[in-house]
């Protein structure tokens, strides 16, 4: 996250932290826990590394320099992709992992409400987006998990300024015209959460950007409300009932 | 320790096919990311085409596009690359590599095979 | 599909700093690799992600990056690191290569 502050415990309860372990182990993606074995993510964080095997997801965390070898963690059961993601294209860039043991919730670790589908009448006006991600483009993961409030851009005005590439409906956009703060590598996969009558949604996943916090350059984030059908569908049929934490 | 085996070269006509090898071993396999590179005779190296781990992804240098396949066989620890329509400037030592690839720092080869000479010639 | 261009030849007394170049496109916003290759043999990682060095590598290689050049830098230079450098950036599902430079120990 560029221009952000240190998030405190149980601010974000839903963040997760994708960490792959091959020789060393490094976080690589954020995620949001969406259900008790259920945790909402990016595809593109799996380009390139193995599905399964040398994942470790950490919840119910705040500052990754905490996790040491006796840290619990939860691996994956599986990952489902969406079958429309193709490698560096910015489409579809969702994808689920079921976790092999499902979470307890606590104050620290619980999901964060799912948007109806196909919304697009709420005006979101308090949105944020967290992660451990760089704080700039050629920085490094942080150890505390930072927040920044970012509002959100119309598709027109994010397209304007990505004449290069297609915003679809299917993408949101968030940034400053002058900059400053955004969301950044590894930041990926994290959630943008957005506060509408009290209660948190997750209006969309980190995807991507033309670099970081960059002068008109906004954050790019698959927009979950258009993928609801999907994800209840992937969730139901692997789960046979759905355990989303929907909206009231 | 890594070892990286490659074998499959030889002398092939134009037109001709060839199918390498890479055989791997001292890691997990089926971990990594793993790339096809070569080098013509004199010249600089060159890539060809690389393979995710689970074999779901490949992608080609547009020189090799439509001519050669990339594949995996993650039970057998080995890398492959089918090569038909073989012109003469396919010719070229062939090194298999083990890549180290993500989304955020991008791509690094740091272990090498020895290489297996291609020449295409009639 | 962005080049990556490298000065065909540099050379250098022993025990000076050898400096080769890599320029590109907007390379400084990419993470560059640096090969090391003696006649007669396989490419040797030597520089990844930019600055950092694989343990067997000696401390006397360092790279850097920024805006449209990296560099891969060899204080105290030695017979031994004569060889052929190549740089290497990774772009959009593409892996790309520099031509080479010969590092020439006078």
């Known amino acids: 996250i560029v221009g952000g502050t240190n998030s405190s415990w149980g601010e974000w309860p839903w963040q997760v932290s994708l960490q792959v372990k091959l020789t060393a182990q490094r976080h690589l993606c954020g995620g949001s826990l969406i259900g008790h074995q259920w945790v909402l993510t990016a595809a593109h964080c799996f380009d390139g590394l193995p599905l399964q095997d040398v994942w470790r997801i950490y919840s119910g965390i705040l500052n990754l320099s905490d996790i040491t070898k006796d840290t619990p963690f939860s691996q994956i059961k599986e990952i489902i992709i969406h079958q429309n993601y193709k490698v560096s294209e910015g489409n579809h860039d969702i994808a689920l992992i079921k976790l092999q043991a499902p979470l307890n919730y606590t104050e620290f670790q619980k999901p964060i409400c799912l948007p109806s589908k196909g919304d697009t009448s709420t005006i979101y006006t308090n949105c944020w987006v967290t992660g451990w991600g760089f704080s700039k483009e050629k920085g490094e993961i942080q150890n505390i998990l930072q927040k920044v409030n970012i509002p959100l851009v119309t598709n027109e005005e994010c397209q304007k300024r990505y004449q290069d590439y297609k915003i679809t409906q299917r993408m949101v956009c968030a940034g400053y015209k002058e900059g400053g703060k955004d969301a950044c590598k590894g930041d990926s996969g994290g959630p943008l959460v957005c506060k509408h009558n009290g209660m948190w949604r997750l209006v969309g996943i980190t995807s991507w950007g033309e670099g970081c916090a960059r002068r008109e350059q906004p954050g790019v984030y698959t927009k979950v409300a258009e993928y609801m059908d999907w994800i209840l569908e992937k969730t139901q049929s692997s789960d046979g009932k759905a355990q989303m934490q929907s909206p009231a | 320790e890594v070892q990286l085996l490659e074998s499959g070269g030889g002398l092939v006509q134009p037109g001709g096919s060839l199918r390498l090898s890479c055989a791997a071993s001292?890691?997990?396999?089926?971990?990594?990311?793993m790339v096809w590179v070569r080098q013509a005779p004199g010249k600089g190296l060159e890539w060809v085409s690389y393979?995710?781990?689970?074999?779901?992804?490949?992608f080609y240098a547009d020189s090799v596009k439509g001519r050669f396949t990339i594949s995996r066989d993650n039970s057998k620890n080995t890398l492959y690359l089918q090569m038909n329509s073989l012109r003469a400037e396919d010719t070229a030592v062939y090194y298999c590599?083990?890549?180290?690839?993500?989304?955020?720092?991008?791509?690094?080869?740091?272990?090498w095979g020895q290489g297996t000479l291609v020449t295409v010639s009639s | 599909q962005s080049a990556l261009t490298q000065p065909p030849t540099v050379s250098v007394s022993p025990g000076q700093t050898a400096r080769i170049t890599c320029s590109g496109n907007?390379?400084?916003?990419?993470?560059v690799a640096w090969y090391q290759q003696k006649p007669g043999q396989s490419p040797m990682l030597v520089i990844y992600?930019?600055?950092k060095r694989p343990s067997r590598v000696s401390e006397r290689f360092s790279g850097s990056n920024s805006a449209n050049t990296a560099t891969l830098s060899i204080s105290g230079t030695q017979a031994l690191d004569e060889a052929d450098y190549y740089c290497?950036?990774?772009?959009?599902?593409?892996?790309?290569f520099g031509g080479g430079t010969r590092l020439t120990v006078l």
């Open positions: 590599a083990m890549g180290s690839y993500d989304y955020i720092w991008g791509f690094y080869s740091d272990h």
């Open positions: 001292g890691f997990t396999f089926s971990w990594y990311t």
């Open positions: 393979i995710y781990p689970s074999g779901g992804a490949t």
């Open positions: 907007k390379l400084g916003d990419k993470y």
């Open positions: 992600q930019d600055t």
């Open positions: 290497q950036a990774w772009d959009s599902s593409i892996v790309i």
